[in-house]
């Protein structure tokens, strides 16, 4: 028998420095977690102790903090090289800065293979990107070889900016021939490493003949066997065992997100490459694990540029950006409108001639807007200003919801109106009218939404049974501020870009902004 140790990360999202327990900015260092310096300590410890070790990443290193905003992927290549990753799968966020923003900083600089079997380049891009990412890679591990096949969410064109010269195929259809090829080349230990979410990971384990292990990402799934060490609630045991259609037991793993855990899976193979046993657990990278001094020193060196960046002007406002709780928790506020407009703008994807865009709606809890920006400072807006408005380090995500769920959300928005509570919704692509004289749960008297399948966008009444795409903060997607109906009833959830980054990009693009209060939210019967 031969034993392999798979160390894995996924959805690190730019958390190069240690973070607080909730993966936001580290405040009290003695209680902080993760970060590449701490990760390196643990990886090196395992590499020294065990003979056959692979360090893998299942995608979405890009996007999430000011590190990515400033360094645009160069930081990913640099620190992943320093940690000596063995392979990485492409995630949807690796395309956030377009194909060029993937090729130059990461694909050309990485000293490890970057994989995806279901992304096919066409046209002029095919020759430019040839060999820079691969469908599979065979790696020598100790005295054996291990094949690694990559995959990426086929929803990437709706979630990021891969352009028109990359085709995202069905994962299972694309993976099978690559695995078959590895088999003909006498590779009998095969890992599928990819970024399509836990449900697809399980399908791959079930359907792709010859895959021995699946290491996934995208859904930020936390799996654990036994008592979990922090706040994350396990979605199942680690590893999650899937019985394949041909009767094999295939371990499936994922390691939550944000570099908080290091996935640790031990697999025992027989001489023919069959999995005999698999066990392990994610390792919580808490402060009991010291940060590696040389990596930490490198992080501190790279940090300097970030501090300079945060005070530079992104653009100007010629109006007061009202982000006060007195406005945003009670009525339409122009800071809410600005943020929602930025959220929609960040999700412009012309993927179908029938649609002007795939999504037109935004909702945003007023309690998430934490500060106004005064235009009387020469109109200057900096990253620092935006960090005061959006201090929680969240993301603006894409969900699919039924109209009936949206109606419930808007009822919840005003169910206890007047108490300055955070659930009051700011909107984009939505016209809502409330009648506060009616009882809670029955206060939405009009709810019109902007069409997407139209050449001239206009507002139509919400249909209860229709499925709508909506951009919203991850906080809401996870049921925050009492929006349990969103969490419970959402039909799909894809994590998006860092909130501050979305707004800063929009302001930089517009150069001068002047958001107004324009009647997106109205109150009827003169009760307000």
């Amino acid at each position: 028998a031969w034993e392999l140790t798979i160390l894995h990360t996924n959805d690190v999202h730019s958390r190069l420095e240690q973070t607080s327990e909730d993966s936001s900015k580290c405040v009290n260092a003695s209680r902080c977690m993760g970060g590449v310096a701490r990760l390196f300590t643990k990886v090196q410890q395992i590499r020294r102790a065990e003979p056959n070790v692979l360090l893998l990443d299942a995608g979405d290193q890009y996007q999430g903090t000011i590190w990515f905003t400033v360094y645009k992927g160069a930081e990913v290549a640099h620190f992943m090289n320093a940690l000596r990753y063995d392979a990485m799968a492409l995630g949807n966020h690796e395309f956030d800065n377009g194909v060029e923003g993937l090729i130059e900083p990461l694909l050309k600089e990485a000293k490890f293979p970057i994989l995806s079997a279901n992304i096919k380049a066409k046209g002029p891009l095919a020759s430019q990107i040839s060999g820079l990412y691969l469908p599979y890679k065979v790696l020598p591990v100790g005295d054996e070889v291990v094949g690694i096949v990559g995959y990426t969410s086929k929803e990437t064109p709706f979630l990021s900016n891969p352009g028109t010269n990359l085709v995202f195929e069905d994962e299972i259809t694309a993976l099978q021939p690559e695995v078959d090829k590895l088999k003909t080349l006498n590779v009998n230990k095969i890992i599928a490493l990819g970024h399509s979410g836990f449900e697809m990971d399980k399908l791959i384990a079930q359907k792709v003949r010859g895959v021995d292990v699946v290491v996934g990402g995208h859904s930020n799934t936390f799996l654990y066997t036994g008592n979990p060490p922090s706040k994350e609630v396990p979605a199942g045991k680690y590893p999650f065992i899937v019985t394949s259609d041909d009767g094999r037991k295939v371990p499936v793993v994922q390691a939550y997100a944000f570099g908080k855990y290091l996935g640790y899976l031990k697999i025992e193979f027989d001489e023919r490459g069959n999995v005999i046993s698999s066990h392990g657990n994610p390792i919580l990278l808490n402060s009991s694990i010291p940060e590696d001094p040389s990596i930490k020193a490198d992080i501190n060196k790279w940090r300097i540029k970030l501090d300079n960046y945060s005070t530079q002007e992104l653009g100007k406002t010629i109006v007061y950006l009202d982000g006060s709780s007195q406005s945003c928790r009670f009525r339409e506020c122009n800071m809410g409108n600005l943020i929602c407009d930025a959220m929609i703008n960040n999700n412009l994807r012309h993927t179908d001639e029938m649609f002007w865009n795939h999504v037109s709606m935004c909702i945003l809890n007023g309690g998430g807007i934490r500060s106004p920006i005064d235009e009387r400072n020469n109109g200057t807006i900096t990253w620092e200003n935006l960090a005061a408005v959006l201090p929680f380090g969240g993301t603006f995500d894409l969900v699919q919801l039924k109209g009936s769920t949206l109606k419930k959300a808007f009822e919840h928005s005003v169910h206890r109106y007047g108490q300055s509570t955070g659930e009051f919704l700011q909107v984009g692509g939505i016209h809502v009218v409330y009648d506060l004289s009616r009882k809670p749960g029955d206060r939405v008297v009009k709810l019109d939404v902007l069409c997407t399948k139209c050449r001239v966008p206009s507002y139509d009444p919400l249909k209860m049974d229709e499925v709508y795409k909506v951009i919203l903060p991850n906080f809401l997607a996870n049921g925050g501020d009492g929006f349990q109906m969103i969490k419970d009833e959402l039909l799909r959830h894809d994590s998006g870009d860092q909130d501050i980054n979305v707004v800063s990009t929009y302001i930089s693009k517009m150069k001068v902004i002047y958001p107004a209060v324009e009647g997106r939210i109205k109150f009827s019967t003169g009760s307000h």
Epitope: G142, D143, L185
Partner: antibody, heavy 119, light 107 residues
Framework: QVQLVESGGGVAQPGRSLSLSCAAS????????MHWVRQAPGKGLEWVAL????????YYADSVKGRFSISRDNSKNTLYLQMNSLRAEDTAVYYC????????????WGQGTLVTVSS | EIVLTQSPATLSLSPGERATLSCRAS??????LAWYQQKPGQAPRLLIY???NRATGIPARFSGSGSGTDFTLTISSLEPEDFAVYYC?????????FGPGTKVDIK
Amino acid sequence: QVQLVESGGGVAQPGRSLSLSCAASGFTFSDYGMHWVRQAPGKGLEWVALIWYDGSFEYYADSVKGRFSISRDNSKNTLYLQMNSLRAEDTAVYYCVRDGQWGSRLDYWGQGTLVTVSS
Amino acid sequence: EIVLTQSPATLSLSPGERATLSCRASQSVSRYLAWYQQKPGQAPRLLIYDASNRATGIPARFSGSGSGTDFTLTISSLEPEDFAVYYCQQRSNWIFTFGPGTKVDIK
């Protein structure tokens, strides 16, 4: 059928350099690791170097490490051996060999090219 | 580095006889042991890989056995074309070594 044809052998002075090539045909070159193996006149076989199917890993015998460099051009179906700081003991027939299965078998051999290091 | 020792250095036999060639490793080589045949003026030819698997086109009279440190190549009934030098070869951590060879000549 698989064919491996070595070239570039000849006479070189000690301390000088020589470059060997191997043209491969009859199989998908980019799918296979490739080796150089040598045989001094009247002696046994000595493994020299291995290069991974895509050129990403290289392995060398201690006797040539730091002096010889194995490389490949998959677009040209060609394997190379750059030999620097040649010594008299490098005199041998150099065989280009296909790795049939991840180092467990060296399944196809060229006819070899003779390298003579002499002053 | 793993050292391979082959015995005997020379084996003198007649056609039709059984040949038993031995290869011993200085430490365990798992299953990664192969056997090659070389005739004068020719390149070596793969006979056996992974200790006991016959290569494509190799006659059934050639067989390999053993594991760990002791391996054997058996030619059940020598044919005239089998008189040659036989080398064993191992791989450990991607470093390859050959044995010194056993010469099988006609008695």
